[in-house]
Amino acid sequence: ECGHISVSAPIVHLGDPITASCIIKQNCSHLDPEPQILWRLGAELQPGGRQQRLSDGTQESIITLPHLNHTQAFLSCALNWGNSLQILDQVELRAGYPPAIPHNLSCLMNLTTSSLICQWEPGPETHLPTSFTLKSFKSRGNCQTQGDSILDCVPKDGQSHCSIPRKHLLLYQNMGIWVQAENALGTSMSPQLCLDPMDVVKLEPPMLRTMDPSPEAAPPQAGCLQLSWEPWQPGLHINQKCELRHKPQRGEASWALVGPLPLEALQYELCGLLPATAYTLQIRCIRWPLPGHWSDWSPSLELRTTERAPTHHHHHHHH
């Protein structure tokens, strides 16, 4: 190796200056005794190199690039060798930004996978390899005092979410949770969440069904629908409230919301609808009165109201 580049910093803030030095060893005897060292950034020759011969006979060229505006580029020092440029050494330069504070951190507890899934927004592009780590600890109180640390959760590349498995969770006990972002230019941390995994539980929705007509029960009135639902069994012991939404299958009508319904209602007569009309219905539930997240909407149930003109317009519960 005849030449060697050293730089003030291989990674800098975008737009910052960078200084580089290229030294050519004296024992490269096949070279011109007073060679002219050239600099190139990417494909472009860079003027402004200051060259000197050092006391030990080596040649040194120093260049300052006033603004590195490329997020990634190769800086090389070279010599003219005949009609071609002979590259002596090159280094990769990177420029970008320190990570912004991750924001909108939120978590939900999935009881089926037994994991706490947290997601966040990473903020603007840094142009540098940036790692995110979901950090957490158990706390007896309101997260002012830190208990046992929980193993860091590292998302897969490019993902802004991470799952903490059940073995690291304690239900009905608070956890402090935050995201740390780190790259070569700095570290940032999101505001800390303090939560009990059960308070962010997201249940599966019930399954909507048509109510089986029983011989003794009156048929639904015109403009009414009779439906029932089967709760998601693993969430059955969690107090919940639910809501229905419905809209005619045809046309551009928006969803109409009906609720809150107690999960235990299990059957419902929905009235005040258009006669002889096909409707799409869905249901969702949330842990209540304790905190939780709404479930997704259930798969749709499609039902048709009876032919005759409606006689009354009200919502009515049947337990």
Epitope: L111, T112, T113, S114, R166, K167, L171, M198, P231, Q233, P234, L236, H237, I238, N239, P262, E264, A265, L266, P289, H319
Partner: antibody, heavy 118, light 107 residues
Framework: EVQLLESGGGLVQPGGSLRLSCAAS????????MGWVRQAPGKGLEWVSS????????PYADSVKGRFTISRDNSKNTLYLQMNSLRAEDTAVYYC???????????WGQGTLVTVSS | DIQMTQSPSSLSASVGDRVTITCRAS??????LNWYQQKPGKAPKLLIY???NLQNGVPSRFSGSGSGTDFTLTISSLQPEDFATYYC?????????FGGGTKVEIK
């Protein structure tokens, strides 16, 4: 402190009836599912029935379905088990218990013994 | 219905021993598995809920693990007061089934 106190057990003839009660204190009774679990002499635990917080959902074990009825009176903080058409195999200590959100039983009452024998 | 197979049905151990009891469900039950301790003439007492959560007031020598179909209750160092019968219970769906029990006796 959460407390559950069963009563109503005793000796009854096959085919007879008995009503067990469980008085609850120390928690908001109306917010929790409750349940009955029994244990025959020298045997393991067997779930009998549960009831939702407002009483609308009442699952039963196949072995008691159609014969036992679970109910609750939230104004009295009391859980009941009406047992009809009793059989010798219903002989057991009957425990009432509060159900946790993910279906565990805690705490349990001290139990009341039901003996079905002629 | 979900069947719970608990093993062993009984075991003899000494104070200080590490004891492991297993429960196998006939189908996947996520983490909906609870463990109880019962002493003669007493009501059962909850030890572990949702497979691995230690109930308040239960000594940390008790731990639970597993998910899906296979679950384990471990007592890291058996104490004299731990000699009792232990039951697992599934709460994924009705009926709420108990395992057959494991009696831990003094060797």
């Amino acid at each position: 402190e959460v407390q559950l106190l069963e009563s109503g057990g005793g000796l009854v003839q096959p085919g007879g009836s008995l009503r067990l009660s469980c008085a609850a204190s120390g928690f908001t009774f109306s917010l929790y599912w409750m349940g009955w679990v029994r244990q025959a002499p020298g045997k393991g635990l067997e779930w009998v029935s549960s009831i939702s917080s407002s009483g609308g959902v009442t699952p039963y074990a196949d072995s008691v379905k159609g014969r036992f009825t679970i109910s609750r009176d939230n104004s009295k903080n009391t859980l009941y088990l009406q047992m009809n058409s009793l059989r010798a195999e219903d002989t057991a200590v009957y425990y009432c218990a509060k159900l946790g959100e993910l279906g565990w039983f805690d705490p349990w009452g001290q139990g009341t013994l039901v003996t079905v024998s002629s | 219905d979900i069947q719970m197979t608990q093993s062993p049905s009984s075991l003899s151990a000494s104070v200080g021993d590490r004891v492991t009891i297993t429960c196998r469900a006939s189908q996947g039950i996520s983490s909906y598995l609870n463990w109880y301790q019962q002493k003669p003439g007493k009501a059962p007492k909850l030890l572990i809920y949702y497979a691995s959560n230690l109930q308040n007031g239960v000594p940390s020598r008790f731990s639970g693990s597993g998910s899906g179909t296979d679950f384990t209750l471990t007592i890291s160092s058996l104490q004299p007061e731990d000699f009792a019968t232990y039951y697992c219970q599934v709460s994924w769906e009705y009926p709420l089934t108990f395992g057959g029990g494991t009696k831990v006796e003094i060797k």
